[in-house]
């Protein structure tokens, strides 16, 4: 990947990445550099008949660094802090390649909740308001409610009213999504408004 | 039917501030998000960024954070855009439009277009 | 953010022709959505999550991919297909739109 377009790569925290390295055809290679936000990683050098010797440059991610044949980086266990630009240079007897990558971090979403602030007016019609949520939640994830297939609303809240006499019983579905995971969670809002219903009974007692 | 009407077109000096409406119909409002996308002249889209149309909260797009602000009228289902200490880059037509869910987005506002000219 | 870029840029056909736009993204994404806008109006939902025509959208259009590479296309192109075609990314914000594809017909 030349250096004016970065490779964008997507990581998942707590997994393994590799960031693909292309060598130039035919050319003896001297050494590999690979940086992590301007500061050196790793420096490489191949040799035809031996293993070839890898200097780890970095500490921090020292233990969680490999390489593949074909020195490509490897990282694994992925941390949020190994979110950044990533570069390999490639110094042949006659150029130097640089080849780019911007590594992002997502996070595969966790335990999704809906929170219910439901109320019973006098004409016995039952306004639910739900909220979901997922843990860690950041702007790359995405929220929507549905019902029979039907999208009710593309946030994390949703205010609808239910009418007992009138609605067949009705399942809400939240759905959580980020680029690398999703998940659901499902409520009846007869069992929500029933509860209410009980609630409202009871303090008029 | 679900509509968005965007108030008309503006004519302001550099410096000054611009207001721009979006007016929802047709859905409940505090259910979708709504976005803001910039359209300078014969260029392409620019995701400006959303509001929260149920708690209020806006979240920006990098390039608009300090001098853009999205706000909401929820009584009249109304989301804002206002502009301030315009800049000749400004000049565009701004769209709303409705998040149906993984941002897509499924009804336009009808776009107003903003000059800036000293 | 993750950049989109579509090609070509113009895109010019004959009535009844088959023809595909093409949107590559700098980075892998989920879900691909497609807008068509016309000069001087707002611009249209067309297809949604890759593969799903907008509400109105002719059946002579279809879209598929997945990762960085999507794809539009028009069956038989017809006279009232002329227009500018977006795709946008959601998978990561800024959500960002591509550059467009102009379709002109002959």
């Known amino acids: 990947q030349s250096s004016l377009t970065p490779l964008m790569v997507n990581g998942i925290l707590g997994e393994s990445v590799t960031l693909p390295l292309e060598f130039p055809a035919g050319e003896k290679v001297n050494f590999i550099t690979w940086l992590f936000n301007e500061t050196s990683l790793a420096f490489i050098v191949p040799h035809e008949t031996k293993s070839p010797e890898i200097h780890v440059t970095n500490p921090k991610q020292g233990k969680r660094l490999n390489f593949t044949q074909s020195y490509s980086l490897q990282l694994s266990n992925l941390k949020m802090e190994d979110t950044g630009s990533y570069r390999a240079q490639i110094s042949t007897k006659t150029s130097a390649k640089l080849s780019s990558y911007t590594l992002r971090i997502l996070r595969q979403l966790r335990n999704i909740q809906v929170t219910n602030h439901s109320q019973l007016f006098q004409n016995m019609t039952c306004e639910l308001h739900l909220t979901c949520s997922v843990e860690d939640a950041d702007d790359n994830v995405s929220f929507r409610w549905e019902a029979l297939g039907n999208t009710l609303s593309s946030q994390p809240n949703l205010t609808v009213s239910w009418d007992p006499r009138i609605s067949s019983e009705q399942d809400y579905t939240c759905i959580a999504e980020n680029a690398v995971s999703n998940l659901s969670f499902s409520v009846s809002a007869q069992k929500l408004c029933e509860d209410v219903k009980i609630q409202y009974t009871d303090t008029k007692m | 039917q679900i509509q968005l009407v965007q108030s008309g077109p503006e004519l302001k000096k550099p410096g000054e501030t611009v207001k721009i409406s979006c007016k929802a119909s047709g859905y409940t409002f505090t259910n979708y998000g709504m976005n803001w996308v910039k359209q300078a002249p014969g260029k392409d889209l620019k995701w400006m960024g959303w509001?929260?149309?149920?708690?209020?909260?806006?979240r920006y797009a990098d390039d608009f954070k300090g001098r853009f602000a999205f706000s909401l009228e929820k009584s009249a289902n109304t989301a804002y855009l206002q502009i301030n200490n315009l800049k000749n880059e400004d000049m565009a037509t701004y769209f709303c439009?409705?998040?149906?869910?993984?941002?897509?987005?499924?009804?336009w506002g009808t776009g107003t277009t903003v000059t800036v000219s000293s | 953010q993750i950049v989109l870029s579509q090609s070509p840029a113009i895109l010019s056909a004959s009535p009844g022709e088959k023809v595909t736009m093409t949107c590559r993204a700098s980075?892998?994404?989920?879900?691909m959505h497609w807008y068509q806008q016309k000069p001087g109006s707002s611009p249209k939902p067309w297809i949604y999550a890759t593969s799903n025509l907008a509400s109105g959208v002719p059946a002579r259009f279809s879209g598929s991919g997945s990762g960085t590479s999507y794809s539009l296309t028009i069956s038989r192109v017809e006279a009232e297909d002329a227009a500018t075609y977006y795709c946008?990314?959601?998978?990561?914000?800024?959500?960002?739109f591509g550059g467009g594809t102009k379709l002109e017909i002959k």
């Open positions: 439009a409705r998040d149906y869910g993984r941002w897509y987005f499924d009804v």
């Open positions: 980075s892998s994404v989920s879900h």
């Open positions: 509001i929260n149309t149920y708690s209020g909260e806006p």
């Open positions: 946008q990314q959601w998978s990561s914000t800024p959500r960002t």
